[in-house]
């Protein structure tokens, strides 16, 4: 028997520095977790102790903190090289800055193979990107060889900016021939490494003949066997075992997100490359694991540029940006409008001639807007200003909801109106009218939404049975501020870009902004 140790990360999302337990900015260092310096300590410890070790990443290193905003992927290549990753799969967020923003900082600089079997380049891009990412890679590990085949969510064109010259094929259809090719090369130990979410990971384990292990990402799935060491609730045991259509037991793993855990899976293979056993657990990278001094010193060196960036002007406002709780928790506020407009703008994807865009709606809890920005400072808006408005380090995500769920969400928005509570929704692409004289749960008297399947966008009444795409904060997608109906009833959830980054990009693009209060949210006469 031959034993392989797979160390894996996914959805690190720019958390190069240690973070607090909830993966936001580290405040009390003695209680902080993750970060590449701490990760390196643990990886090196395992590499020294065990003979056959692979360090893999299942995508979405890009996007999530100011590190990505400033360094644009150069930081990913640099520190992943320093940690000596063996391979990485492309995630949807790796395309956030377009194909050029993937090629130059990461694909050309990475010293490890970057993989995806279901992304096919065409047109002029085909020759430019040839060999920079691969469908699979075979690595010698001790006295054996291991094949690693990559995959990426086929939803990427709706979630990021891959352009028109990359085709995202069905994962299973694309993986099978590559795995078959590996078999002809006499590679009989094959890992599928990819970024399509836990459901697809399980399908790959079930359907792709020859895949021995699946290491996934995208859905931030936490798996654990035994008592979990932190706040995350396991979605299943680690590894999650799938019985393949040809009767094999295939371990599937994922390691939550944000570099908080290091996935640790030990696989035992027989001489024919069959998995005999698999066991392990994610390792919580808490403060009991010291940060590696040399990586930490490097992080501190790279940090300097971030501090400078925070105070640079992104753009100007010529109006007061009202982000006060007195406004945003009670009525339409122009800061809410600005943020929602930025959220929609960040999700412009012309992927279908029938649609002017795939999504037109935004909702945003007023309690998530934490500060106004005064225009009487020469109109200057900095990252620092925006960090005061959006201090929680969240993301603006894409969900699919039924109209009936949206109606419940808007009822919840005003179910206890007047108490300055955070659930009051700011909107974009939505016109809502409330009648507060009616009883809670029946206060939405008009709810019109902007069409997407139209050449001239206009507002139409919400249809209860129709499925709508909506951009909202991850906080709401996870049921925050009492929006349990969103969490329970959402049909799809894809994590998006860092909230501050979305707004800062929009302001930089617009250069001068002047958001107004324009009647998106109204109260019917006599009640307010």
């Amino acid at each position: 028997a031959w034993e392989l140790t797979i160390l894996h990360t996914n959805d690190v999302h720019s958390r190069l520095e240690q973070t607090s337990e909830d993966s936001s900015k580290c405040v009390n260092a003695s209680r902080c977790m993750g970060g590449v310096a701490r990760l390196f300590t643990k990886v090196q410890q395992i590499r020294r102790a065990e003979p056959n070790v692979l360090l893999l990443d299942a995508g979405d290193q890009y996007q999530g903190t100011i590190w990505f905003t400033v360094y644009k992927g150069a930081e990913v290549a640099h520190f992943m090289n320093a940690l000596r990753y063996d391979a990485m799969a492309l995630g949807n967020h790796e395309f956030d800055n377009g194909v050029e923003g993937l090629i130059e900082p990461l694909l050309k600089e990475a010293k490890f193979p970057i993989l995806s079997a279901n992304i096919k380049a065409k047109g002029p891009l085909a020759s430019q990107i040839s060999g920079l990412y691969l469908p699979y890679k075979v690595l010698p590990v001790g006295d054996e060889v291991v094949g690693i085949v990559g995959y990426t969510s086929k939803e990427t064109p709706f979630l990021s900016n891959p352009g028109t010259n990359l085709v995202f094929e069905d994962e299973i259809t694309a993986l099978q021939p590559e795995v078959d090719k590996l078999k002809t090369l006499n590679v009989n130990k094959i890992i599928a490494l990819g970024h399509s979410g836990f459901e697809m990971d399980k399908l790959i384990a079930q359907k792709v003949r020859g895949v021995d292990v699946v290491v996934g990402g995208h859905s931030n799935t936490f798996l654990y066997t035994g008592n979990p060491p932190s706040k995350e609730v396991p979605a299943g045991k680690y590894p999650f075992i799938v019985t393949s259509d040809d009767g094999r037991k295939v371990p599937v793993v994922q390691a939550y997100a944000f570099g908080k855990y290091l996935g640790y899976l030990k696989i035992e293979f027989d001489e024919r490359g069959n998995v005999i056993s698999s066991h392990g657990n994610p390792i919580l990278l808490n403060s009991s694991i010291p940060e590696d001094p040399s990586i930490k010193a490097d992080i501190n060196k790279w940090r300097i540029k971030l501090d400078n960036y925070s105070t640079q002007e992104l753009g100007k406002t010529i109006v007061y940006l009202d982000g006060s709780s007195q406004s945003c928790r009670f009525r339409e506020c122009n800061m809410g409008n600005l943020i929602c407009d930025a959220m929609i703008n960040n999700n412009l994807r012309h992927t279908d001639e029938m649609f002017w865009n795939h999504v037109s709606m935004c909702i945003l809890n007023g309690g998530g807007i934490r500060s106004p920005i005064d225009e009487r400072n020469n109109g200057t808006i900095t990252w620092e200003n925006l960090a005061a408005v959006l201090p929680f380090g969240g993301t603006f995500d894409l969900v699919q909801l039924k109209g009936s769920t949206l109606k419940k969400a808007f009822e919840h928005s005003v179910h206890r109106y007047g108490q300055s509570t955070g659930e009051f929704l700011q909107v974009g692409g939505i016109h809502v009218v409330y009648d507060l004289s009616r009883k809670p749960g029946d206060r939405v008297v008009k709810l019109d939404v902007l069409c997407t399947k139209c050449r001239v966008p206009s507002y139409d009444p919400l249809k209860m049975d129709e499925v709508y795409k909506v951009i909202l904060p991850n906080f709401l997608a996870n049921g925050g501020d009492g929006f349990q109906m969103i969490k329970d009833e959402l049909l799809r959830h894809d994590s998006g870009d860092q909230d501050i980054n979305v707004v800062s990009t929009y302001i930089s693009k617009m250069k001068v902004i002047y958001p107004a209060v324009e009647g998106r949210i109204k109260f019917s006469t006599g009640s307010h």
Partner: antibody, heavy 123, light 108 residues
Framework: QVQLQQSGAGLVKPGASVKLSCKAS????????MHWVKQRPGQGLEWIGM????????NNNEKFKNKATLTVDKSSNTAYMQLSSLTSEDSAVYYC????????????????WGQGTSVTVSS | DIVMTQSQKFMSTTVGDRVSITCKAS??????VAWYQQKPGQSPKLLIY???DRYTGVPDRLTGSGSGTDFTLTISNVQSEDLADYFC??????????FGSGTKLVIQ
């Protein structure tokens, strides 16, 4: 010092088989992959395949799949390559070479080579 | 399969000169390239790995460079003992290796 000693030249008839040997010394035989490379007279180098003496794991160039069989004898620190159904196309010098890999980024190269075995296929 | 093309079959030089031998990969291979020297009647010897790392004992007159698809082996201050065939090899497609067809260095 590291040495790879290959068996002597051979004249073989078409259709026959030949087993070439490569005896390793000066290093731990079971720690390194062994590769085999073909060189036809006045031609370039062609990679045939590799074997790891510890596990017996092999990988072959598809072109040589039905031509070359790689084996090892750990007790004598010897790697073997059997060539079957020989034709004039198989007339060449065959080298064994030690595979050296490691570091970061992963680098691979053939750092020690045997002196080569000349095989001539003729009736 | 990745093809390694050494378009110059022969290169003529004189002692003390500097010569550059080139090798082109049919697709991007990063820096996964090695160079070998084969003197007449001898087996090949490793010179360069990872496109630019000199193997132990190789004189610093020999330098490897390049990444992606274009690679060069440069010999400065050419000596008579440099008369040999030079082969490039890619290992990006491990476990398949391919060699270039070779360039013969002729010293006038």
């Amino acid at each position: 010092q590291v040495q790879l000693q290959q068996s002597g030249a051979g004249l073989v008839k078409p259709g026959a088989s030949v087993k070439l040997s490569c005896k390793a010394s000066g290093y731990t035989f079971t720690n390194y992959w062994m590769h085999w490379v073909k060189q036809r007279p006045g031609q370039g180098l062609e990679w045939i395949g590799m074997i790891h003496p510890n596990s017996g794991s092999t990988n072959n160039n598809e072109k040589f799949k039905n031509k070359a069989t790689l084996t090892v004898d750990k007790s004598s620190n010897t790697a073997y390559m059997q060539l079957s159904s020989l034709t004039s196309e198989d007339s060449a010098v065959y080298y064994c070479a030690r595979f050296f890999f490691g570091g970061y980024p992963h680098y691979y190269a053939l750092d020690y080579w045997g002196q080569g075995t000349s095989v001539t296929v003729s009736s | 399969d990745i093809v390694m093309t050494q378009s110059q079959k022969f290169m003529s030089t004189t002692v003390g000169d500097r010569v550059s031998i080139t090798c082109k990969a049919s697709q991007n291979v990063g820096t996964a390239v090695a160079w070998y020297q084969q003197k007449p009647g001898q087996s090949p010897k490793l010179l360069i790995y990872s496109a630019s790392d000199r193997y132990t004992g190789v004189p610093d007159r020999l330098t490897g460079s390049g990444s992606g698809t274009d690679f060069t082996l440069t010999i400065s201050n050419v000596q008579s003992e440099d008369l040999a065939d030079y082969f490039c090899q890619q290992y990006s497609s491990f476990p398949l290796f391919t060699f270039g067809s070779g360039t013969k260095l002729v010293i006038q």
